[in-house]
Interface confidence: low
């Protein structure tokens, strides 16, 4: 876990400033798998290589993020960089969290996690335990560290929820399961509300 993210970052850091700009423009029009959302143009154009890598992984998760990066690089004629990513993909294998369930397809189904976002931000206190349960399966290393870096429980939960829009149903279920184990009474209370 995290290896694909590092490979994407290395590839993007190999781009010149103008190539990075072209990469972003192509990312705005590239054909996406059904159900996946597009990174908003305004935010996308303001990102450096690190920000963009994090956004690619949070929107598409590692496996599809890697694939998408390769597609765009090939489209730009940067075959060598794309080949380096292909090698990483073959070595690391597919990441389960980026499986066939589209990341954006469940956003409208009213999952517990979406319904109770504000309450969870306000009331979850044992965030590190939740993070450990999600680390490796749902959260990349970079995302895990980013949430851990926040100081208060509320800030940690806000940061965690910043990644939720790109999650599929499996990811949201994993968070719910972690909450049931760590904050069972809170979950029961919210389910009854």
């Amino acid at each position: 876990m995290g290896r694909a993210r590092d490979a994407i970052l290395d590839a993007l850091e190999n781009l010149s400033g103008d190539e990075l700009k072209k990469f972003k423009m192509k990312l705005l029009t590239v054909q996406l798998r059904e159900g996946y959302g597009r990174i908003p143009r305004g935010a996308l154009l303001q990102m450096d290589a690190i920000d963009l890598t994090d956004k690619l992984v949070s929107y598409y998760l590692e496996s599809y993020g890697l694939e998408l990066t390769m597609t765009v690089l090939r489209d730009m004629g940067l075959q060598e960089l794309a080949e380096q990513l292909q090698t990483t993909k073959e070595e690391s294998g597919a990441v389960a969290a980026a499986a066939s369930v589209p990341a954006q397809s469940t956003a409208r189904t009213g999952h517990f996690v979406d319904q109770h976002r504000q309450a969870l931000i306000a009331r979850v206190t044992e965030v590190d335990g939740v993070l450990d349960a999600l680390h490796g399966s749902v959260l990349t290393e970079g995302q895990y560290q980013a949430v851990r870096a926040e100081t208060t429980s509320q800030d940690k939960m806000r940061k965690l929820f910043s990644f939720v829009p790109s999650w599929n149903l499996t990811c949201k279920d994993s968070l719910l399961q972690a909450l049931k184990e760590i904050h069972p009474y809170l979950v029961m209370d919210l389910e009854q509300s």
Partner: antibody
Framework: QAQLQQSGTELARPGSSVKLSCKAS????????INWVKQRTGQGLEWIGE????????YYDEKFKGKATLTADKSTSTAYMELRSLTSEDSAVYFC??????????WGQGTLVTVSA | QIVLTQSPAIMSAFPGEKVTITCSAT?????MHWFQQKPGTSPKLWIY???NLASGVPARFSGSGSGTSHSLTINRMEAEDAATYYC?????????FGSGTKLEIK
């Protein structure tokens, strides 16, 4: 206030080496490429190379490979350029500049290197 | 590598006159950047990504172009615009600069 502070004037003997520094402040050093540019008196700008401090990745103009070595120290937010086997052709002002495409390029004040016997 | 050729090398213009500096590339360049430099000072970013004025640059300046042909235009020349202007491409390593255009006021 973002700043790049370059080291002072260098007077060097032919055949020797110098190491120029470029200290960053007021911005996150690791997310920018740091470029180095040469300008001889009365001449134009020549791009030497670029380093990404986070990864240590470097890119050089072929002309400066073997002449210049770019490094960076993340702990002190300082980029370095070592010039070796100096000749009079290396006498010039050397600029460091940070880049991030939507902000364009921001330059240090320059370091004058004079190579003389 | 991409070679950038600027023309003219030196030019002078009257106050109020329209000035155009061109930058021709040996290969297609996605975006061109322009720098202004006055004697004894560091270059300043003047126009970035072909047509965007850097902070503090007067609106009389503009940039345009695509592919191998790019230009910087001053709508009405003023004394403070006297300087050397350089184009730079960051589309492909190694990044390269044009040879510069020295603009003087008559």
């Amino acid at each position: 206030q973002a700043q790049l502070q370059q080291s002072g004037t260098e007077l060097a003997r032919p055949g020797s080496s110098v190491k120029l520094s470029c200290k960053a402040s007021g911005f996150t050093f690791t997310i920018y490429g740091i470029n180095w540019v040469k300008q001889r008196t009365g001449q134009g700008l020549e791009w030497i190379g670029e380093i990404y401090p986070r990864s240590g990745n470097t890119y050089y103009d072929e002309k400066f490979k073997g002449k210049a070595t770019l490094t960076a120290d993340k702990s002190t937010s300082t980029a370095y350029m070592e010039l070796r086997s100096l000749t009079s052709e290396d006498s010039a002002v050397y600029f460091c500049a940070r880049s991030r495409e939507w902000e364009g390029v921001f330059w240090g004040q320059g370091t004058l290197v004079t190579v003389s016997a | 590598q991409i070679v950038l050729t600027q023309s003219p090398a030196i030019m002078s213009a009257f106050p109020g006159e329209k000035v155009t500096i061109t930058c021709s590339a040996t290969s297609s360049v996605s975006y061109m950047h322009w720098f202004q430099q006055k004697p004894g000072t560091s270059p300043k970013l003047w126009i970035y990504s072909t047509s965007n004025l850097a902070s503090g640059v007067p609106a009389r300046f503009s940039g345009s172009g695509s592919g191998t042909s790019h230009s910087l235009t001053i709508n009405r020349m003023e004394a403070e615009d006297a300087a050397t202007y350089y184009c730079q491409q960051r589309s492909r390593y190694p990044f390269t600069f044009g040879s510069g255009t020295k603009l003087e006021i008559k």
